[in-house]
């Protein structure tokens, strides 16, 4: 599909993106396919990510999220989470699609991904209380490792949007 | 409001296995960390393990592996230590508490157990 | 293993007297250190929590303060009813270590 014709579809519902950055895909013959990430998005594997720099809380980043036609970060794999870890500033929290809305430790990912406890990565206190619903990623002196801790929803963070690559 | 009711006194042999319990009431048992904690005349607290029951995750002291095992039943709300090879170095009042936030805010009366020949 | 010294090991007061116990870590914790009393055949009961946060019910004579490695309970005017041991918890790493108390007596 041609990015013309890319665009003329998406200016009926705004395009948000204006700038992508495109890496050609090794395609079958006569055929060029293009994987694209907004201007200023990290790319890794499937996806791109995007860093916040400014702070708010967890229910607005997922809006400022929905705003670029992404998500909060779901974490899939150990690569996934390890990619992102090396791109954050170590005296940051970040929020990612992670709430407990109940307070009964029943976790869920805005994606609907299914929460598998075997596949965490609390950091070893975490998580510490029922009230705190939402979920950061820190990075801690002792041991010294980025991991997962449950915090105060309304406590401004800043945050990791993820979207799908777009092909052209 | 939060109580734990800890099992009664063990009088134990050396050598033996004691297993004591923890019944939380007054709040949802499978979403805060249950403690246990040693306490020794002389000794003060050692921190033995922590469970949290939702999930069955525990953090142990190394210093107690291969001593202490914690577990957790989250349909009777119980929270269960199980001591083994008993010496009379285990000779302590045992506590679980319940941590909120990083604090062990709620505490059992203890149970005392006793290992002599 | 963060270990901490607690300081002194006994202390008597007379009643109305400022008691200050000092816990100091070998590691960086923050603010996570708690603090707790102890009366004979009980329990301890926490009276302050990680951030130096006084815990509901108890009287404001009692306060902490410090962060990183270097902390101190006090007590404003002992009253004969805090007659106890007193232990400081740090909750900042695992293993989680206790001080090794102070037993607070009256002069």
């Known amino acids: 599909q041609k990015y013309s014709q890319l665009l003329e579809k998406k200016t009926t519902k705004e395009l948000v993106h204006t700038t992508l950055e495109c890496v050609k895909k090794n395609m079958p013959v006569e055929e060029t396919a293009w994987s694209c990430c907004p201007k200023n998005w990290k790319s890794f594997s499937s996806n791109c990510y995007f860093i916040s720099t400014e702070s708010a809380s967890w229910q607005d980043s997922e809006k400022d999220c929905a705003r670029m036609e992404a998500h909060l970060l779901v974490i899939n794999t150990q690569e996934e989470q390890d990619f992102i870890f090396q791109n954050l500033q170590e005296e940051s929290a970040y929020f990612v699609g992670l709430s407990d809305p109940e307070g009964q430790r029943h976790w869920q990912w805005v994606d609907q991904t299914p929460y598998n406890e075997s596949s965490t990565f609390w950091h070893p206190r975490e998580p510490s209380d029922p009230n705190e619903r939402c979920v950061v990623l820190n990075f801690r002196k002792s041991p010294k490792r980025w991991g997962w801790n449950d915090v105060n929803c309304l406590g401004p963070q800043r945050s990791v949007c993820e979207m799908m690559k777009i092909h052209l | 409001q939060v109580q734990l009711q800890q099992s009664g006194t063990e009088l134990m042999k050396p050598g033996a296995s004691v297993k004591i319990s923890c019944k939380a009431t007054?709040?949802?048992?499978?979403?805060?960390?249950i403690e246990w904690v040693k306490q020794r005349p002389g000794h003060g607290l050692e921190w033995i393990g922590e469970?949290?029951?939702?999930?069955?995750?525990?953090n142990d002291n190394e210093k107690f592996k291969g001593k202490a095992t914690i577990t957790a039943d989250t349909s009777s709300k119980k929270a269960y230590m199980q001591l083994s090879s008993l010496t009379s170095e285990d000779s302590a009042v045992y506590y679980c508490a319940r941590r909120g936030g990083y604090s062990f805010a709620f505490w059992g009366q203890g149970t005392l157990v006793s290992v002599s020949a | 293993e963060t270990t901490v010294t607690q300081s002194p090991a006994s202390l008597s007061m007379a009643i109305g007297e400022k008691v200050t116990i000092r816990c100091v870590t070998s590691t960086d914790i923050d603010d996570d250190v708690n603090w707790y009393q102890q009366k004979p055949g009980e329990p301890p009961k926490l009276l302050i929590s990680e951030g130096n946060t006084l815990r509901a019910g108890v009287p404001s004579r009692f306060s902490s303060s410090g962060y990183g490695t270097d902390f101190v309970f006090t007590i404003e005017n002992m009253l004969s009813e805090d007659v106890a041991d007193y232990y400081c918890?740090?909750?900042?790493?695992?293993?989680?270590?206790f001080g090794g108390g102070t037993k607070l007596e009256i002069k």
């Open positions: 918890l740090q909750s900042g790493n695992l293993p989680y270590t």
């Open positions: 469970i949290l029951p939702g999930s069955g995750r525990t």
């Open positions: 007054g709040y949802t048992f499978s979403t805060y960390w």
